[in-house]
Interface confidence: low
């Protein structure tokens, strides 16, 4: 049977139970190298309060859909009285990047998770040429997630002294430059990550090759490497690589750009300091509020709620969207679809599309930027459901009693952008995590 | 104030049953993960059964197919029933909660001792 997601094939995959502090190891298309599970585990479930090792999903009893990914065992499980088999559940969601397996829960039989993922898309156009697993898990099993850095167009510019060549990165993934041909970018070779240009001419200095790795808890490395033997003229007969270094801040602070720290025969240390390198508690809340100890902050945007059907509107040109942010009131014209976010076309009102439900909500604050996030929506023809991304700014002379009101600013690839200053969205800070 | 109390020890002839109750106060029961564990005289604690906080149940091979844990969450109490006891599970047996938001909390214990 051939491997359902190939892209996915090249790398073992983690996902974690924080609640019963159990970490995951997944290998999709063949078996996970981990020797307590077994020669055959496709799914190894690692206890670390009891040091123990079950094998939940077997890679010859695997059974694949274009959307799920079924793992079965020959364990016997007991669940009302039947005799079922343990298995994992893995169900697929079209995303924009190769993304992360999330666990999800498990009953006594089956494990279930959700992985968003180019892979699972219905067609390429999110697809990379080369992209690698962008998320570690610490020491105390939390996730540090960079997927959020990962340009789908241009790249990064890093911050160096040389003013005749330009270093350009992404990361993660390699540099789209069909999608956003930007006169400096357009020359940068297909493939690469770091991108060199001199002039004009632009060289691959690096290509992703292998995942996030994390070094202590608040420093992540990446690596690129040029894969081709062609030595570059320049290079004084090295290879070219790259090493980027993510630091999370000591305390919270607005968003810097990479900075070279480092460059000597064509290998070139980078280091990036954003709280995108921090544990993704830090960052994120699935309420719409963010406080306590761990992050550092306290914000809480529930007052935007709205009651009594009412909801906020926003002219997006052919389209009217109706925002009811912070609760779970339906919005009229999106009614049963529990949508946060409800596109209507003008010129025919009875199109109507969720843009991202309410219970699949993200607050984000991260690099001094506020941001809720709606996804889960309607299919677009792509596979992707759609979703709202809502950047928050600091205004205490909103009008509508400082509440503000939502602005349209762009769709791209069925994600809806809005800005919204609000007396809500200003931050007071606590002291360090 | 949060505390765990072991319940249904005692002495048990080889092959016989038992069922030991741990009752919890003070925690949001169904959030926390349920373990025993098991200490015998002269020798370190050892793990014995697993209750996460969703139903998942797993097992010390010395004891699988004989020990069964589970929990009732409207009397805040998990169970651990043992079968076919052996005079190698004479043991003080310990449960423990633990959860992403607590220390660890530990009962005070309760002595099985299988002996004819």
């Known amino acids: 049977q051939a491997a359902p997601f190939p892209e996915l094939c090249s790398y073992t995959w983690e996902a974690v139970d924080t609640k019963n502090n159990v970490l995951y190891k997944i290998n999709i298309c063949g078996s996970v190298d981990i020797v307590q599970c077994g020669p055959s585990s496709a799914v190894c479930m690692h206890d670390l309060k009891t040091r123990t090792y079950h094998s939940v999903g077997d890679s010859v009893l695997r059974s694949a859909t274009r959307s799920l990914l079924e793992f079965n065992t020959t364990v016997s499980c007991d669940q009302q009285g039947t005799n079922h088999r343990v298995q994992s559940s893995i169900a697929f969601l079209c995303g924009k990047t190769l993304g992360t397996p999330e666990f999800v829960t498990a009953t006594e039989c089956v494990h279930y998770f959700e992985w968003r993922t180019t892979a699972a898309c219905k067609k390429d156009i999110f697809k990379a040429n080369k992209e690698v697993p962008c998320y570690v898990f610490d020491e105390e099993l939390r996730k540090h997630d960079l997927n959020p850095l990962i340009k789908l167009s241009g790249a990064y510019l890093v911050d160096d002294s040389d003013p005749d060549t330009s270093l350009f990165i992404n990361v993660c993934r390699d540099i789209d430059t069909l999608r956003d041909p930007g006169s400096q970018l357009r020359a940068c070779p297909p493939g690469t990550a770091a991108c060199l240009v001199r002039g004009h001419q632009a060289f691959d200095v690096g290509q992703p090759r292998d995942g996030l790795k994390v070094v202590r808890k608040d420093r992540l490395v990446l690596s690129y490497v040029r894969e081709e033997a062609g030595k570059l003229d320049f290079c004084d007969g090295h290879s070219p690589a790259v090493t980027i270094t993510f630091v999370c801040p000591s305390e919270r602070r607005e968003g810097t750009i990479p900075k070279l720290t480092a460059k000597s025969n064509c290998r070139y240390e980078i280091e990036w300091i954003t709280e995108y390198a921090c544990h993704r508690d830090y960052l994120e809340s699935k309420t719409c509020s963010l406080s306590g100890e761990q992050q550092d902050v306290s914000i809480d945007l529930t007052p935007l709620a709205q009651s009594g059907g009412s909801s906020y509107i926003s002219d997006g040109k052919e389209y009217l969207f109706y925002l009811n942010v912070c609760g779970e009131t339906e919005i009229q014209f999106c009614n049963k679809k529990q949508a946060a976010v409800c596109q209507v076309k003008k010129s025919d009102t009875s199109q109507v599309k969720a843009a991202g439900r309410y219970h699949n909500q993200t607050l984000r604050y991260s690099d001094g930027d506020l941001t809720l996030i709606y996804f889960g929506g309607d299919e677009c023809s792509s596979g992707f459901q759609r979703m709202s991304v809502i950047n928050f700014r600091c205004n205490k002379t909103a009008g509508n009693d400082g509440k503000g009101t939502p602005v349209f600013t762009g769709e791209v690839d069925c994600t809806y952008f809005f800005t919204w200053d609000t007396e809500y969205a200003c931050v007071h800070h606590h002291h360090h995590h | 104030d949060v505390q765990l109390v072991e319940s249904g020890g005692g002495l048990v002839q080889p092959g016989g049953s038992l069922r030991l109750s741990c009752a919890a106060s003070?925690?949001?029961?169904?959030?926390?993960?349920m373990d025993w564990y098991r200490q015998a005289p002269g020798k370190q604690r050892e793990w014995v059964a697993t209750l996460a906080s969703y139903g998942w149940k797993t097992y010390a091979d010395s004891v699988k197919g004989r020990f069964t844990i589970s929990r009732d969450n409207a009397k805040n109490t998990v169970y651990l029933q043992m079968n076919s006891l052996r005079p190698e599970d004479t043991a003080v047996y310990y449960c423990?909660?633990?959860?992403?938001?607590?220390?660890?909390?530990w009962g005070q214990g309760t002595l099985v001792t299988v002996s004819s």
């Open positions: 003070g925690i949001i029961f169904s959030d926390n993960r």
């Open positions: 423990k909660a633990s959860s992403p938001v607590l220390n660890d909390i």
